[in-house]
Interface confidence: low
């Protein structure tokens, strides 16, 4: 599923991601844009054989498991393919463990260079939330 | 249960390209991956690639580049792989299977015979 | 490439012989190190997952064993059934990689 940006705040605020560990909604969207472009089935391979799945591109190393991932450590304690739902439970329940991981959204390399220090309240801008 | 279900035989003439079926039923088709294995006589089972049908992704092993291209169609639960430039190294039994790491699901096979 | 080296090429035995089946891999490959059946004119058939996990459905006599560089596949006690071809796999990396195979076949 592509989500469109007004759609995707409001999913994302419905499973209580707003203001989570003090990161605003805008924050989470501008993630989700260019992590995946809003694609729930976005995946990408990594250098070190690992992939990224979702809306927010969880990495296989550490936190779900595809069965593909050696020395996988699985903290979100899911199959990686739960994470190409439609329905993003499963992604905001695992981004929900990472960001309080102690690196906050710094875990997520996109957010960290497209989206940290910008006006990312324009994400959620016009939308009935 | 989970089943792969491939094309069947083909006899082809080189120079010619063939595309090659593996319908899948009995699991949630978007979200593993299908591997695709190339098996000749004396030469064991080589990987061909990978395609994720949920989202088009696909990995080639660097051998089959612009010999092999996957696709899949999610409204029949159908991968594809075509096979271009046919010549008679291309002869053999072509497999998909389930991707989980191991391949604990394959289909039965597909026979290409390429011959003037 | 990873590459993995069966050995031997070709075992026979006595049904009722125990055997070993041996893979070698070209670099350390943690336990990512999958056993196959394969009969003639049939798909291959998952034995062991992860170098010591049986796959659902096989025989107890089916066991493996090994962690890096070297594996082995055991049957205990060999029946007429399993005759045939035994090839491995590698999940480490990519390209997936596939041994040789060892023929097992009836003295």
């Known amino acids: 599923k592509v989500f469109g940006r007004c759609e995707l705040a409001a999913a994302m605020k419905r499973h209580g991601l707003d203001n989570y560990r003090g990161y605003s909604l805008g924050n989470w969207v501008c993630a989700a844009k260019f992590e995946s472009n809003f694609n729930t089935q976005a995946t990408n391979r990594n250098t070190d054989g690992s992939t990224d799945y979702g809306i927010l591109q969880i990495n296989s190393r550490w936190w779900c498991n595809d069965g593909r991932t050696p020395g996988s450590r699985n903290l979100c304690n899911i199959p990686c393919s739960a994470l190409l739902s439609s329905d993003i439970t499963a992604s905001v329940n695992c981004a929900k463990k990472i960001v309080s991981d102690g690196n906050g959204m710094n875990a997520w390399v996109a957010w960290r260079n497209r989206c940290k220090g910008t006006d990312v309240q324009a994400w959620i801008r016009g939308c009935r939330l | 249960q989970v089943q792969l279900q491939e094309s069947g035989a083909e006899v082809m003439k080189p120079g010619a390209s063939v595309k090659i079926s593996c319908k899948a039923t009995?699991?949630?088709?978007?979200?593993?991956?299908i591997e695709w294995v190339k098996q000749r006589p004396g030469h064991g089972l080589e990987w061909i690639g990978e395609?994720?049908?949920?989202?088009?992704?696909?990995y080639y092993n660097e051998k089959f580049k612009g010999k092999a291209t996957f696709t899949a169609d999610t409204s029949s639960n159908t991968a594809y792989m075509q096979l271009s430039s046919l010549t008679s190294e291309d002869s053999a039994v072509y497999y998909c299977?389930?991707?989980?790491?191991?391949?604990?699901?394959w289909g039965q096979g597909t026979t290409l015979t390429v011959s003037s | 490439d990873i590459e993995l080296t069966q050995s031997p090429a070709t075992l026979s035995v006595t049904p009722g012989d125990s055997v070993s089946l041996s893979c070698r891999a070209s670099?350390?490959?943690?336990?990512?190190l999958h056993w196959y059946q394969q009969k003639p004119h049939e798909s291959p058939r998952l034995l062991i997952k992860?170098?010591?996990q049986s796959a659902s459905g096989i025989p107890s006599r089916f066991s493996g064993s090994g962690s890096g560089t070297d594996f082995t596949l055991s049957i205990n006690s060999v029946e007429t059934e399993d005759f045939g071809m035994y090839f491995c796999?590698?999940?480490?990396?990519?390209?997936?990689?596939f041994g040789g195979g060892t023929k097992l076949e009836i003295k």
């Open positions: 299977a389930r991707g989980d790491g191991f391949y604990c699901y």
């Open positions: 009995g699991y949630t088709f978007t979200t593993y991956w």
């Open positions: 395609i994720l049908p949920g989202s088009g992704s696909t």
């Open positions: 670099q350390s490959i943690s336990n990512n």
């Open positions: 992860y170098a010591s």
């Open positions: 796999q590698q999940s480490n990396s990519w390209p997936r990689t």
